[in-house]
């Protein structure tokens, strides 16, 4: 679609803009129906009101916008584009609003948007250009500093025939728009793996939350570029062991705190390096709480209390000696 002449200063990816203008402009800072507004706090809350669209007449002063607990379903291009633009909007919370589709350019024309929370929405269709707004190989930098995407995995029967991890990562990496991102939360998304290139392209990250996923290994993930990383949450995953390369990279990060609780650590001969590292490192928070899950004979043993004699691997029997 093309922009109308009255909206010619905006890109064609924002078809809502031209049509979202009331015929008689509202009072400049009128509060939309079904919302609560505080001009002093620069805050608008339209919470648990079963809204199916983003309100059109949002006050220009809004800095914090809560649209949680609604039924938005889809965020089209330019969903927040207004004339004049919402130039002050810095924090946008859309959690729990039944969004399953976020289109390219959904957050365009929000020049001050620093915090975005899309948690608890079953995002079956997250456009690669949801955050970059453009399919250019290098987009204009996004102002986003915090992106909260906890529990955005749709139910299994609603997932498309593609990797959910891949869809999310494509949106994070498109156009290198999120180079300034400092906090990324991806907890509770059933992630089985972390695509290897994702962290390398988010060099400003300070806080990364991958807790409560299904990560089995970090073998192909590189933390080397994340020199500013301060916290890495890996609790409640399916990690069995951290290998030397990962241990060395984590140890090399100057400000890092790593959280590893509630993983099914396998305490066999492959765990020896990690146990040695744990005893020496200061980067793991609550390291004294880490316990073995396997093998059975080692269950609930504290990793820090293990020595090399405890960590053996059953020899692999030649086929002629194996029993069925």
């Amino acid at each position: 679609s093309s922009p109308t002449s009255s909206a010619s200063s905006f890109s064609s990816s924002a078809p809502f803009l031209a049509s979202a203008v009331s015929a008689q402009p509202p009072l400049p800072d009128q509060c939309p129906a079904l919302c609560e507004c505080s001009e002093a706090a620069r805050t608008v809350k339209c919470v648990n009101r079963n809204l199916t669209e983003v309100p059109t007449d949002l006050p220009a002063y809004v800095r914090n916008l809560f649209l949680t607990g609604n039924q938005l379903a889809v965020l089209p291009a330019g969903a927040f584009a207004r004339r004049p633009p919402l130039a002050e909007l810095a924090a946008l919370n859309l959690s729990g609003s039944r969004l399953d589709e976020v289109r390219a350019g959904a957050f365009e024309h929000l020049p001050s948007l620093r915090q975005l929370d899309l948690s608890h929405n079953p995002l079956a269709d997250l456009s690669p250009f949801a955050f970059s707004g453009s399919n250019a190989s290098v987009s204009a930098p996004s102002p986003l500093v915090e992106l909260i995407l906890n529990h955005i995995v749709p139910p299994e029967d609603e997932r498309q025939n593609r990797s959910f991890e891949g869809m999310v990562v494509a949106a994070l990496l498109a156009g290198r728009a999120l180079q300034g991102l400092r906090r990324l939360e991806l907890a509770s998304n059933h992630f089985l793996y972390l695509p290897r290139d994702v962290l390398a392209q988010l060099p400003s990250l300070r806080h990364l939350d991958l807790s409560n996923n299904s990560l089995v290994s970090l073998t192909y993930v590189s933390f080397r570029n994340l020199t500013h990383l301060e916290s890495l949450h890996l609790e409640d995953n399916a990690l069995k062991v951290l290998h030397n390369g990962t241990l060395a990279e984590l140890q090399g990060l100057p400000h890092i705190r790593v959280f590893l609780d509630n993983n099914p650590w396998v305490c066999d001969c492959h765990m020896a390096d990690m146990v040695t590292w744990l005893k020496e490192t200061e980067v793991v928070q609550g390291k004294d709480r880490l316990t073995c899950a396997y093998p059975e004979k080692m269950r609930n043993r504290v990793l820090l209390e293990l020595n090399s004699a405890d960590l053996d691997c059953d020899p692999i029997l030649p086929p002629s000696l194996q029993t069925s």
């Epitope: 679609s1 078809p15 809502f16 031209a18 049509s19 979202a20 009331s22 939309p32 129906a33 079904l34 919302c35 339209c46 009101r49 079963n50 809204l51 199916t52 669209e53 983003v54 309100p55 059109t56 007449d57 039924q71 379903a73 889809v74 089209p76 291009a77 399953d100 589709e101 289109r103 079956a124 269709d125 498309q160």
Partner: antibody, heavy 120, light 111 residues
Framework: EVQLVESGGGVVQPGRSLRLSCAAS????????MHWVRQAPGKGLEWVAY????????YYADTVKGRFTISRDNSKNTLYLQMNSLRAEDTAVYYC?????????????WGQGTTVTVSS | DIVLTQTPLSLSVTPGQPASISCRAS??????????LHWYLQKPGQPPQLLIK???NLESGVPDRFSGSGSGTDFTLKISRVEAEDVGVYYC?????????FGQGTKLEIK
């Protein structure tokens, strides 16, 4: 039974105003978004305007923007279309229609229409 | 704006025979979550009525001789066996974005 009944149409001179109403019954009016759609004589259907269930969202076709205003009174189960600065090309049958949402919705109930004729 | 082009603009069908109407959009009106294309029938002297929602879902109370298919830009409405009461003008409509637009209509007559 879902019923939508439009009223307020008539013959009006160019530049004048008219207010259409749509009385709804047989469903919980405040749970539904509402549209106005028009049909010029012998022509096809043209979407005019939309208002969300709680009057938080309003959208207009470019052809009527700045001249028409959609509104509703949920306590009276009534939808309105205030039409100002009317033009000959606004001559049409105006239908009100119900939807569950703007983009994920569809026009699932229609009124019989009210005729607006703009002529000098 | 998204343009919907219907073909044919009119068709004359013998009762009991099938009929098919095409609707082509100037850009995709499908996502992986939903298809934003709907079909209506306007019988002579009446308002339109919803037949098919989201490309292929039959509206309650509509006879099952009507069916819809398609995704992306190409959509089809089929009537398996045309009956006399099916005469009127058929419209497709998208809800992908504002403005919502309709096809120009296809007039179905009985031979």
């Amino acid at each position: 039974e879902v019923q939508l009944v439009e009223s307020g149409g008539g013959v009006v001179q160019p530049g004048r105003s008219l207010r259409l109403s749509c009385a709804a019954s047989g469903f919980t009016f405040s749970n539904f978004g509402m549209h106005w759609v028009r049909q010029a004589p012998g022509k096809g259907l043209e979407w005019v305007a939309y208002i969300s269930s709680g009057s938080t969202s309003f959208y207009y076709a470019d052809t009527v923007k700045g001249r028409f205003t959609i509104s509703r009174d949920n306590s009276k189960n009534t939808l309105y279309l205030q039409m100002n600065s009317l033009r000959a090309e606004d001559t049409a049958v105006y239908y009100c229609s119900r939807t569950n949402s703007l983009l994920r919705g569809f026009f699932d109930a229609w009124g019989q229409g009210t005729t607006v004729t703009v002529s000098s | 704006d998204i343009v919907l082009t219907q073909t044919p603009l009119s068709l004359s069908v013998t009762p009991g025979q099938p009929a098919s109407i095409s609707c082509r959009a100037s850009q995709s009106v499908s996502s992986s979550s939903y298809t934003y294309l709907h079909w209506y029938l306007q019988k002579p002297g009446q308002p339109p009525q919803l037949l098919i929602k989201s490309a292929s879902n039959l509206e309650s109370g509509v006879p099952d001789r009507f069916s819809g298919s398609g995704s992306g830009t190409d959509f089809t409405l089929k009537i398996s066996r045309v009956e006399a009461e099916d005469v009127g003008v058929y419209y497709c409509q998208h809800s992908w974005e504002i403005p919502l637009t309709f096809g120009q209509g296809t007039k179905l007559e009985i031979k």
